[in-house]
Interface confidence: medium
Amino acid sequence: MMTGTIETTGNISAKKGGSVILQCHLSSTMAQVTQVNWEQHDHSLLAIRNAELGWHIYPAFKDRVAPGPGLGLTLQSLTMNDTGEYFCTYHTYPDGTYRGRIFLEVLESSVAEHSARFQIPLLGAMAMMLVVICIAVIVVVVLARKKKSLRIHSVESGLQRKSTGQEEQIPSAPSPPGSCVQAEAAPAGLCGEQQGDDCAELHDYFNVLSYRSLGSCSFFTETG
């Protein structure tokens, strides 16, 4: 079952002659990313990022496309013809293929400057709102804890006399995106939860993601 989701930079605008970063992020899955393909609106491949073999920028775009940051792509010296859809395709094992869409609008310099002037205060306002929400959340959490500690203290003597050895379990809910709760995250290894023989498979040089004859399967030839 494909549990992952692709988050993209969505609809973006940039000025003619400038550069822009196209970014896709695969989340909510432990699947291994074997390859990311970047395609243009006419479905021509711009670039490929293979987990083991690295980047390949297609010759037609070598002068204006730079790999990264991360699995993203940087388009440089933008022209009006660059306006349109861009797709990132994540080939993963064992999930299969995920696809994200970005719409890029290249604007004449003056229009882009106007939109940038409008965007900066908007971003500032959003940041301020986020700070206010964070403070509110912290205050609520602190007050709740104080209230709880008072309640616990009042029944402490009763608990000491009637101890069952059981602990109250507080179910933890996952934090929503953008929330201010910080959890200490253990870095996932290259293979996520996998161990043993097939764990080394992300290090393989040669694999195939086959669609037509065998469905979305990935094939690896291991080095070892």
Epitope: L53, G54, H56, Y93, D198, L214, T223
Partner: antibody, heavy 125, light 112 residues
């Protein structure tokens, strides 16, 4: 229909090098793995190494490491296998073969199909 | 390296009769994706090898349905339901599970 056409037979002296070419027509050269397999007279098949032209990165059998170089030229859809420090035991038919490919996906040499017609390399003083 | 052992070395057959070739690997060729990384090739006299079966049991395009591949893990079998004169040659199994890729020693099929 993909076809692989190899260069002609070669006679070489011990200690010299040989470079065999394999030209692909039809299909997608860039994202297909090209592998080299040799067969000594009356013997079985022996994998030497492979390359995916798209990335230009080759992988070799330990036995040939340091003596074999596999390259690919995108512009002519041709792969090459160069074997140096030749000895009489290197007398064999050298085959190139293509691995499965998907233009949008990738890659591999999980099976070999098709094969070139073979190139006989004779090493003799 | 994974060692591939084929048997028999030579197989005399009668046209119209079935034939079977065995291939054993020193390590499992079964991947966690459920596929066995084993292929079968036929090399007819004076020709290049040709793919018959890939990933254990998938017939390559253009291969007659009298050829079938089976097995999993370390034991594999190529079966020819009714041998025809054109089936003579040397049959090889090949593992693609790990680098280096290795071939079996070959089984020579000839008409009795």
């Amino acid at each position: 229909q993909v076809q692989l056409v190899q260069s002609g037979a070669e006679v070489k002296k011990p200690g010299s090098s040989v470079k065999v070419s394999c030209k692909a027509s039809g299909g997608t050269f860039l994202s297909s793995a090209i592998s080299w397999v040799r067969q000594a007279p009356g013997q079985g098949l022996e994998w030497m190494g492979s390359i995916i032209p798209l990335f230009g990165k080759a992988n070799y059998a330990q036995k040939f490491q340091g003596r074999v170089t596999i390259t690919a030229d995108e512009s002519t859809s041709t792969a090459y296998m160069e074997l140096s420090s030749l000895r009489s035991e290197d007398t064999a038919v050298y085959y190139c073969a293509r691995g499965p490919s998907e233009v949008k996906g990738i890659l591999g040499y999980v099976w070999f199909d098709p094969w070139g017609q073979g190139t006989l390399v004779t090493v003799s003083s | 390296d994974i060692v591939m052992t084929q048997s028999p070395l030579s197989l005399p057959v009668t046209p119209g009769e079935p034939a079977s070739i065995s291939c054993r690997s020193s390590q499992s060729l079964l991947h966690s994706n459920g596929y066995n990384y084993l292929d079968w090739y036929l090399q007819k006299p004076g020709q290049s090898p040709q793919l018959l079966i890939y990933l254990g049991s998938n017939r390559a395009s253009g291969v007659p349905d009298r050829f079938s591949g089976s097995g999993s893990g370390t034991d594999f079998t190529l079966k020819i339901s009714r041998v025809e004169a054109e089936d003579v040659g040397v049959y090889y199994c090949m593992q693609a599970r790990r680098i280096p890729i290795t071939f079996g020693g070959g089984t020579k099929v000839e008409i009795k």
